[in-house]
C-alpha cells in the first residue's frame, strides 16, 4: 500500500472580510490511524487554527464527518474571516503517539488572502482656524484594508487637488494597511462654503468609492472690514454714528464703541445677516449727545472677532462753541480732507 | 498524563450483574472512544464493545448482546461497563481502553483492570 | 468475524536473538493491525498499529510489516525486558479480535 499523502489542491484562497473560508485537504490513505490538524503558518511558531480530537475551535467546522470510517477529505471551513486570519494554512496528518500525537505528514499549504474594505475616510483640518490666503493642511485616514493597492484623491469643490502626500503603512507584509495623506489647501475669502474631500478607491469596493469630507468653514476665519459713518441728525443736539461691520466669519463677533477712548457700549453680533458666500455682515450704532461734550469727539468702533486681536476704525466728530442764546452746540464730521458743518 | 483509573475487584454469584467503572484523565473524554476488553484466567483477549461519549454511540460483540450495557458520564469522564446474567465464564480481568475513533480498534491507553470472579 | 491466526504460541530465545512472530488473518484487513505486549499482572501495551508504525516511546527494536492477510512481528535483538506475551489484532472490522498470543521466553 502507497505511503499516505496530504493534498491541498488550492495553492491560494481568496475571501472577503466576514466570509467563510473553505480549505481544501484530503488525505490518500486512511493509514496510519491519527488524526488531522490545521495550522497557520509552519515551523515551531506555527497557530493551532483545528485540531480534530482536542480543544474547542468555535469558527471552524468541517466539511465532512471526520468520525466516519472511509473519511478521508479534511476539508474545513472558517467563518468570519478578518484580516488577522491572512496567511498560510497547512493540513497536517498525525499519527497516534503519547503523550503526544507525533507528525506524520502536512499538505503543501494554501495561502488564505482576505480582501477587507477600507474604514470610512477620516477627514481633520488643522486645529486653529486660519485666514484667506493662507495654506492649511488636511489629513485623511482610512484602515484596516486588504490588500495593500490602494488609490486616494483630494478635491476641493470638485477639482482636484495636485499637493498632497500620501502613505501606506506598513511598508511590508501584513495581514491589512492603513493610508494617510496630507494635503495642502489656499484658502480664499469665499471660502465658507467649500468643501474638502478625500477619495478612496479600492478592489473591495466595485468602483464605488469611499468618501470623507470636511467643510472649510470649521477652518476659515475671514476678518472683517469696519466702516464708521455718521448719519444725518437725528435731534437737534444728537448725531447717529454707525459701524459698519462687513465680510466676517465666523459670527463670534463682540463690538465695542469707545468715546475718546472710554467705553461707550459693547455688544456681542446677534441679528446679523448673511451673504452668498457664506460670510455675514451687521450693523451697530451709536446715538451721541453733542450738546454733552465741550470739546472735539474721537469715536471709535473696536471689534474683537473669533478671539482675535481687536481692530479698530474711528470717526472724529467736531465740538464748536456758538453763542449761548443759539442754545446750541455744533458737531462737526471729519471726513479726511473734506470738513461740513452740522448746525 | 492519559490515566484510565478502574473501579476495584468485584466477587458476584451467578445471575447477578456488575457496574465496573474506567475514569478517564488528561484528554478530553468526549474526543476518544472507550473500548472494554476482557481477558479470563490463562486466556488471551476479547472485545466486548465500545462507547463514544460524544455521542453516546455504542457497538457490542454479539456474543454479549442483551446482556452488556455501555454508558459514560461526561461530567465525570467516566466510562461504566455493566454486564448482567453473569455466569462462572465470565470470570475475567476487564479492561477498559482508549481508541482515537469508533472505526480505530488499536488502543493505545488501557486501565490497570478489574478483575470480576464469578462464584457460587 | 475475522480470526487472527498466531504463531508459535510460545518460543524461547536468547538474548540478542532475532525473534519473529506471525499472525495470518482469516481474510483481507488490508494494514490494519496491531499488535501489543503483556506482562504477567499488566494491561496490554500498544506496540505496532496499522501493521508497521511503531507506537511512540517504543524501542526501533520492535517493528512490524505485512498487508493483507499475513503479518509479520520482529524483535530484531531480544532483551531481558522484552519477555512477555504478544498479541497480534485486527482493527479493520469489528468485533474487533486478537490473535491467541505467543508468550515469548529468554533461553
Known amino acids: 500500500e502507497e505511503e499516505l499523502q496530504v493534498i491541498q489542491p488550492d495553492k491560494s484562497v481568496l475571501v472577503a472580510a466576514g466570509e467563510t473560508a473553505t480549505l481544501r485537504c484530503t488525505a490518500t490513505s486512511l493509514i496510519p490511524v491519527g488524526p488531522i490538524q490545521w495550522f497557520r503558518g509552519a515551523g515551531p511558531g506555527r497557530e493551532l487554527i483545528y485540531n480534530q480530537k482536542e480543544g474547542h475551535f468555535p469558527r471552524v467546522t468541517t466539511v465532512s464527518d471526520l468520525t466516519k470510517r472511509n473519511n478521508m477529505d479534511f476539508s474545513i471551513r472558517i467563518g468570519n474571516i478578518t484580516p488577522a486570519d491572512a496567511g498560510t494554512y497547512y493540513c497536517v496528518k498525525f499519527r497516534k503517539g503519547s503523550p503526544d500525537d507525533v507528525e506524520f505528514k502536512s499538505g503543501a499549504g494554501t495561502e488564505l488572502s482576505v480582501r477587507a474594505k477600507p474604514s470610512a475616510p477620516v477627514v481633520s483640518g488643522p486645529a486653529a482656524r486660519a485666514t484667506p490666503q493662507h495654506t492649511v493642511s488636511f489629513t485623511c485616514e482610512s484602515h484596516g484594508f486588504s490588500p495593500r493597492d490602494i488609490t486616494l484623491k483630494w478635491f476641493k469643490n470638485g477639482n482636484e487637488l495636485s499637493d498632497f502626500q500620501t502613505n501606506v503603512d506598513p511598508v511590508g507584509e501584513s495581514v491589512s494597511y492603513s493610508i494617510h495623506s496630507t494635503a495642502k489647501v489656499v484658502l480664499t475669502r469665499e471660502d465658507v462654503h467649500s468643501q474638502v474631500i478625500c477619495e478612496v478607491a479600492h478592489v473591495t469596493l466595485q468602483g464605488d468609492p469611499l468618501r470623507g469630507t470636511a467643510n472649510l468653514s470649521e477652518t476659515i476665519r475671514v476678518p472683517p472690514t469696519l466702516e464708521v459713518t455718521q448719519q444725518p441728525v437725528r435731534a437737534e443736539n444728537q448725531v447717529n454714528v454707525t459701524c459698519q461691520v462687513r465680510k466676517f466669519y465666523p459670527q463670534r463677533l463682540q463690538l465695542t464703541w469707545l468715546e475718546n477712548g472710554n467705553v461707550s457700549r459693547t455688544e456681542t453680533a446677534s441679528t446679523v445677516t448673511e451673504n452668498k458666500d457664506g460670510t455675514y455682515n451687521w450693523m451697530s450704532w451709536l446715538l451721541v449727545n453733542v450738546s454733552a461734550h465741550r470739546d472735539d469727539v474721537k469715536l471709535t468702533c473696536q471689534v474683537e472677532h473669533d478671539g482675535q486681536p481687536a481692530v479698530s476704525k474711528s470717526h472724529d466728530l467736531k465740538v464748536s462753541a456758538h453763542p449761548k442764546e443759539q442754545g446750541s452746540n455744533t458737531a462737526a464730521e471729519n471726513t479726511g480732507s473734506n470738513e461740513r458743518n452740522i448746525y | 498524563q492519559v490515566q484510565l483509573v478502574q473501579s476495584g475487584a468485584e466477587v458476584k454469584k451467578p445471575g447477578a450483574s456488575v457496574k465496573v467503572s474506567c475514569k478517564a484523565s488528561?484528554?478530553?473524554?468526549?474526543?476518544?472512544?472507550m473500548h472494554w476488553v476482557r481477558q479470563a484466567p490463562g486466556q488471551g483477549l476479547e472485545w466486548m464493545g465500545y462507547i463514544n461519549p460524544y455521542n453516546d454511540g455504542t457497538k457490542y460483540n454479539e456474543k454479549f448482546k442483551g446482556r452488556v450495557t455501555m454508558t459514560s458520564d461526561k461530567s465525570t469522564s467516566t466510562a461504566y461497563m455493566e454486564l448482567s446474567s453473569l455466569r462462572s465464564e465470565d470470570t475475567a480481568v476487564y479492561y477498559c481502553?482508549?481508541?482515537?475513533?469508533?472505526?480505530?480498534?488499536?488502543?493505545?491507553?488501557w486501565g490497570q483492570g478489574t478483575t470480576v470472579t464469578v462464584s457460587s | 468475524d475475522i480470526q487472527m491466526t498466531q504463531s508459535p504460541s510460545s518460543l524461547s530465545a536468547s538474548v540478542g536473538d532475532r525473534v519473529t512472530i506471525t499472525c495470518k488473518a482469516s481474510?483481507?484487513?488490508?494494514?490494519?493491525v496491531a499488535w501489543y505486549q503483556q506482562k504477567p499482572g499488566k494491561a496490554p501495551k500498544l506496540l505496532i498499529y496499522?501493521?508497521?508504525y511503531r507506537y511512540t516511546g517504543v524501542p526501533s527494536r520492535f517493528s512490524g510489516s505485512g498487508s493483507g492477510t499475513d503479518f509479520t512481528f520482529t524483535i530484531s535483538s531480544l532483551q531481558p525486558e522484552d519477555i512477555a506475551t504478544y498479541y497480534c489484532?485486527?482493527?479493520?472490522?469489528?468485533?474487533?479480535?486478537f490473535g491467541g498470543g505467543t508468550k515469548v521466553e529468554i533461553k
Open positions: 489484532q485486527q482493527h479493520y472490522s469489528t468485533p474487533w479480535t
Open positions: 488528561g484528554y478530553t473524554f468526549t474526543s476518544y472512544v
Open positions: 481474510q483481507d484487513v488490508t494494514t490494519a
Open positions: 481502553a482508549r481508541s482515537y475513533y469508533d472505526y480505530d480498534g488499536s488502543f493505545d491507553y
Open positions: 496499522s501493521a508497521s
